[in-house]
Interface confidence: low
């Protein structure tokens, strides 16, 4: 959460001399209450915009717009405090509109905008517009708040932003997974055009449960340039456990721009249709085994094996 770096912060408009200032989110009117205070904003509109920074990066920004109520209290309106709170971190950023001239009624409703709060993909924010001065203790509130959820990097508009591209939003691996004979899965995906390694994370589950019954990790070394954009095919051997039939395949890239934090892509294979009278599972055969510390399974022979090749 930050302000867009290089834009001149402007809030003046015809009939109003105004300046934008950084704010500590604690306006002086909290400490020194005034008798006469303005009413709250009438409407707050928030939408997502994309702006370029001074060095050409594209970042998502919140476009905040609000209007004033058409009552006499605008005579006491000295400005506004805009506050953006990132809900998962409690981080808050504020700016203050300081009116350098008195507001007067004119032929259309006063409207204000601000588009300089840089936000993160897939985060929720609470945006508050507080008219200044703030009310006396127990006075009528003169602010309005709205929550806004910034879309994730799958969203078309977000895909081209720098934070999304840096985390791998342009890469579409187009994963396909097919079940082979002899307890094997064939995973195929498109390599990106960077010499970097990938990991395939296989997690298997019983039909209707969310506790894993098998986990396996397979490493794919960095492709050579002539293999960029080619399909990589990997055959994973599953554990022979009846009922351990729903498989989630997750591919984690390690691109230079995002290292361990790149966007992961996944695909799921559902269990085959259950027959009317399911084959009984012997009660001594566990669906899954307890993990031993941080290692994989105790019995090495029980681990999955795999091999892969890049397909041209």
């Amino acid at each position: 959460l930050r302000l867009l770096d290089h834009r001149a912060l402007v809030c003046s408009q015809p009939g109003l001399n105004c300046t934008v200032k950084n704010s500590t989110c604690l306006d002086d009117s909290w400490i020194h209450p005034r008798n006469l205070t303005p009413s709250s904003p009438k409407n707050i509109y928030i939408n997502l915009s994309v702006s370029s920074t001074q060095h050409g990066e594209l970042v998502p920004v919140l476009h905040v717009e609000w209007t004033l109520q058409t009552d006499a209290s605008i005579l006491y309106l000295e400005g506004a405090e805009l506050s953006v709170l990132q809900l998962n971190t409690n981080e808050r950023l504020c700016v203050r509109f300081e009116f350098l001239s008195k507001l007067r009624h004119h032929h259309r409703r006063w409207r204000f905008t601000f588009s300089h709060f840089v936000v993160d993909p897939d985060q929720e924010y609470e945006v508050t517009v507080h008219h200044l001065p703030k009310p006396i203790p127990d006075g009528d509130p003169n602010h309005q708040s709205k929550n806004f959820l910034v879309p994730d990097c799958e969203h078309a508009r977000m895909k081209v932003t720098t934070p999304c591209m840096s985390s791998g939003s342009l890469w579409d691996p187009n994963i396909t997974v097919e079940t082979l004979e002899a307890h094997q899965l064939r995973v195929s995906f498109t390599l990106w055009n960077e010499s970097t390694h990938y990991q395939i994370l296989l997690t298997s589950f019983p039909h209707m449960e969310n506790h894993s019954c098998f986990e396996h990790m397979h490493h794919i070394p960095a492709p050579r340039p002539e293999e960029f954009h080619q399909r990589s095919n990997v055959t994973l051997t599953l554990r022979n456990l009846k009922g351990c039939c729903r498989h989630q395949v997750q591919i984690q890239p390690f691109f230079s721009s995002c290292l361990n934090d790149c966007l992961r892509h996944s695909a799921t294979v559902s269990c085959p249709e259950m027959p009317d009278t399911p084959e009984p599972i012997p009660d001594y055969m566990p669906l899954w085994e307890p993990r031993s510390g941080s290692s994989d399974y105790k019995d090495d022979d029980d681990k999955g094996s795999s091999h892969h090749h890049h397909h041209h």
């Epitope: 370029s52 060095h55 050409g56 895909k159 591209m165 840096s166 721009s257």
Partner: antibody, heavy 126, light 113 residues
Framework: QVQLVQSGAEVKKPGASVKVSCKAS????????MHWVRQAPGQGLEWMGW????????DLAQRFQGRVTMTRDTSISTAYMELSRLRSDDTAVYYC???????????????????WGRGTLVTVSS | DIVMTQSPDSLAVSLGERATINCKTS????????????LAWYQQKPGQPLNLLIY???TRESGVPDRFSGSGSGTDFTLTISSLQAEDVAVYYC?????????FGPGTKVDIK
């Protein structure tokens, strides 16, 4: 070889629309941003905006917002720029230009233009 | 928007002599944390595509003869042709790519004296 080939000259009436095409060859079309720049007769160069061929995302100069649409067809490595509600002062040569390399995920947003089309003359006259 | 100005509007130089073109930006195009100036120079010959000569204010594009050089920082930049050749007759433009909208200088026409 690496080149951008643009469509031929157009004569349009005021109020009409024009769609200029730019076919890329010799490089990976989706790895570079495509920009459009115009030059009115005897005037300088004016940047109109860019399009990201992989996603179709665009960023337009403010004065063209609402009148310019940038699209692409990745199957034929072609970018398009459509300008609507034409006025006589839209008479200009319209260039496509490549800029902003995106071969890895740490994309370059450094938009100098290293490859240009020859330009398409659009004349707006009643 | 960043406003670009160029001087002179045109110049005529004898073959083999030095030609110097100046470009001024209305605000600095130096991005200090990268220590790079976001400025490029282009050549435009009649009926031909524009040609990138210099980027980052001083980096020569591959294939561009070494008689072309760029210098300057912040708001003041120069393109120098150390020994003018007949094929250098053209209009030369500077461009900032520091912030959108990207803007170009009005151009400088170079002729043979």
């Amino acid at each position: 070889q690496v080149q951008l080939v643009q469509s031929g000259a157009e004569v349009k009436k005021p109020g009409a629309s024009v769609k200029v095409s730019c076919k890329a060859s010799g490089y990976s079309f989706t790895d570079y941003y495509m920009h459009w720049v115009r030059q009115a007769p005897g005037q300088g160069l004016e940047w109109m905006g860019w399009m990201h061929p992989n996603s179709g995302g665009t960023d337009l100069a403010q004065r063209f917002q609402g009148r310019v649409t940038m699209t692409r067809d990745t199957s034929i490595s072609t970018a398009y720029m459509e300008l609507s509600r034409l006025r006589s002062d839209d008479t200009a040569v319209y260039y496509c230009a490549r800029g902003g390399y995106c071969s890895t995920l740490s994309c370059s947003f450094y938009w100098y233009f290293d490859l240009w089309g020859r330009g398409t003359l659009v004349t707006v006259s009643s | 928007d960043i406003v670009m100005t160029q001087s002179p509007d045109s110049l005529a130089v004898s073959l083999g002599e030095r030609a110097t073109i100046n470009c001024k930006t209305s605000q600095s195009v130096l991005y200090s944390s990268k220590n790079k100036n976001f400025l490029a120079w282009y050549q435009q010959k009649p009926g031909q595509p524009l040609n990138l000569l210099i980027y980052w204010a001083s980096t020569r594009e591959s294939g561009v003869p070494d008689r072309f050089s760029g210098s300057g920082s912040g708001t003041d930049f120069t393109l120098t042709i150390s020994s003018l050749q007949a094929e250098d007759v053209a209009v030369y433009y500077c461009q900032q790519y520091y912030s959108t909208p990207f803007t170009f200088g009005p151009g400088t026409k170079v002729d043979i004296k």
